[in-house]
């Protein structure tokens, strides 16, 4: 990896678990100011593999609300608005980091957690099963 | 919101910024043990809106490596394997949380940051702009 010289102004840590336990400022900096005006907000409806968004809420997690995509159909929508079963709607999944309160119900102590979320759906050609 | 009784075993914090600055254990807990065997790993190639994955690396960020999807075509792939420009390939974007070293180059001090990443692509019907 890349070795970075340590900043002498860093907070000190005598924690024996260092650097496993770190200080995190929860004042979120949002780098998405320059997002594309062509928002993906309506893609879920206009896609050939449309999806619905389901709210997943967990007060012990940060962020507490995550939206999960569920493909509306097993097939894909064609130009006539019919469902083609020679194509399949599948969820696009991504691993994301969240903060889990640990110990539970603690307001200022968390553990990093990786979860898999479905972000949207895409239309794919079916897998070819080669028979021996 | 939901009020949760505070666990008496929580770490103490006299920090004036509390609860803005919290302790986070970086030993990641992976909740994705039960992932679907139908892995989405080959969807980028089989999709009617295929995409390439580009590595985005930043040592000041945790995770330092993020993979960004870029749609291969402006149109979508039709049944003949040709690009159909009556439809559009568009990126599905998601806001994710990352940790940004703050002050820079500090190993144990971070700030939460929201970034927008493209996870994959989907094929959508284009928006028709009616001219008055």
């Amino acid at each position: 990896g890349i070795t970075i010289p340590r900043n002498p102004g860093c907070p000190n840590s005598e924690d024996k678990n260092f650097p496993r336990t770190v200080m995190v400022n929860l004042n979120i900096h949002n780098r998405n100011t320059n997002t594309n005006p062509k928002r993906s907000s309506d893609y879920y409806n206009r896609s050939t593999s449309p999806w619905n968004l389901h709210r997943n809420e967990d007060p012990e997690r940060y962020p507490s609300v995550i939206w999960e995509a569920k493909c509306r159909h097993l097939g894909c929508i064609n130009a006539d608005g019919n469902v083609d079963y020679h194509m399949n709607s599948v969820p696009i999944q991504q691993e994301i980091l969240v903060l889990r309160r640990e110990p539970p119900h603690c307001p200022n102590s968390f553990r990093l957690e990786k979860i898999l979320v479905s972000v949207g759906c895409t239309c794919v050609t079916p897998i070819v099963h080669h028979v021996a | 919101g939901i009020t949760i009784p505070r666990n008496p075993g929580c770490p103490n914090s006299e920090d004036k910024n509390f609860p803005r600055t919290v302790m986070v254990n970086l030993n990641i807990h992976n909740r994705n043990t039960n992932t679907n065997p139908k892995r989405s790993s080959d969807y980028y190639n089989r999709s009617t809106s295929p995409w390439n994955l580009h590595r985005n690396e930043d040592p000041e960020r945790y995770p330092s490596v993020i993979w960004e999807a870029k749609c291969r075509h402006l149109g979508c792939i039709n049944a003949d394997g040709n690009v159909d420009y009556h439809m559009n390939s568009v990126p599905i974007q998601q806001e994710i949380l990352v940790l940004r070293r703050e002050p820079p180059h500090c190993p144990n001090s971070f700030r939460l940051e929201k970034i927008l990443v493209s996870v994959g692509c989907t094929c959508v019907t284009p928006i028709v702009h009616h001219v008055a």
Epitope: C71, L74, N82, D84, P126 | -
Partner: antibody
């Protein structure tokens, strides 16, 4: 082993509505779609529509749009089809059938006989 | 909508005879990406619901006797019973599941002489 259990025979008056049910047993309800098919001696087998309980999507045969409404209750693993403004033309045997991602409809319910008569 | 035409409408055969019924679609049911034909054959015995016999034009469902043979590709398909048995008395339907609305053939009634 998958099994689809349909509600019993119905005798209803013209102009009324009826809601037929189909309970899914022996498989994960949200992993498959539920198709509905009408059978009459005159028109044979006709596909009415499909619902995906996992994703909430529905698709209908144009012929049955406005006549049939498909819904699903995940908590009871039951699919429903409501038929409205009934006429004698709606008298038929109605089947629910499980569909996979290829559109294969492998398991069929026993059928519900609907008679519309005054 | 895809139109499915089935012939003949009825057949009377003796036990042990070979029987073939046909099904035509007005557009191809072949998916070039996986080389599968999205065509199914169903058997419906009197008073029962349809039972899936063959799918993807030629794949026999588990538990279906091997005397039932599906064949064909694109728009022309057939179901052959190599040696008819008394219990094969039924209506036989073809169905396309390539795209909605799914459509069925009008059926072939098999009678046993």
């Amino acid at each position: 082993q998958a099994h689809l259990q349909q509600s019993g025979a119905e005798l209803v008056r013209p102009g009324a509505s009826v809601k037929l049910s189909c309970k899914a047993l022996g498989y994960t309800f949200t992993d498959y779609e539920m198709h509905w098919v009408k059978q009459t001696p005159v028109h044979g087998l006709e596909w009415i529509g499909v619902i995906h309980p996992g994703g909430g999507g529905t698709a209908y045969n144009q012929k049955f749009k406005g006549k049939a409404t498909l819904t699903a209750d995940k908590s009871s693993s039951t699919a429903y089809m409501e038929l409205s403004s009934l006429t004698s033309e709606d008298s038929a045997v109605y089947y629910c059938t499980r569909g996979d991602h290829d559109g294969r409809t492998d398991y069929w319910g026993q059928g519900t006989t609907l008679t519309v008569s005054s | 909508d895809i139109v499915m035409s089935q012939s003949p409408s009825s057949l009377a055969m003796s036990v042990g005879q070979k029987v073939t019924m046909n099904c035509k679609s007005n557009q191809s049911l072949l998916n070039r990406s996986n080389q599968k034909n999205y065509l199914a054959w169903y058997q419906q015995k009197p008073g029962q619901s349809p039972k899936l016999l063959v799918d993807f034009a030629s794949t026999r469902e588990s538990g279906v006797p091997d005397r039932f043979i599906g064949s064909g590709s694109g728009t022309d398909f057939s179901l052959t019973i190599s040696s008819v048995q008394a219990e094969d008395l039924a209506d036989y339907f073809c169905q396309q599941h390539y795209t909605t609305p799914f459509t069925f053939g009008s059926g072939t009634k098999l009678e046993i002489k």
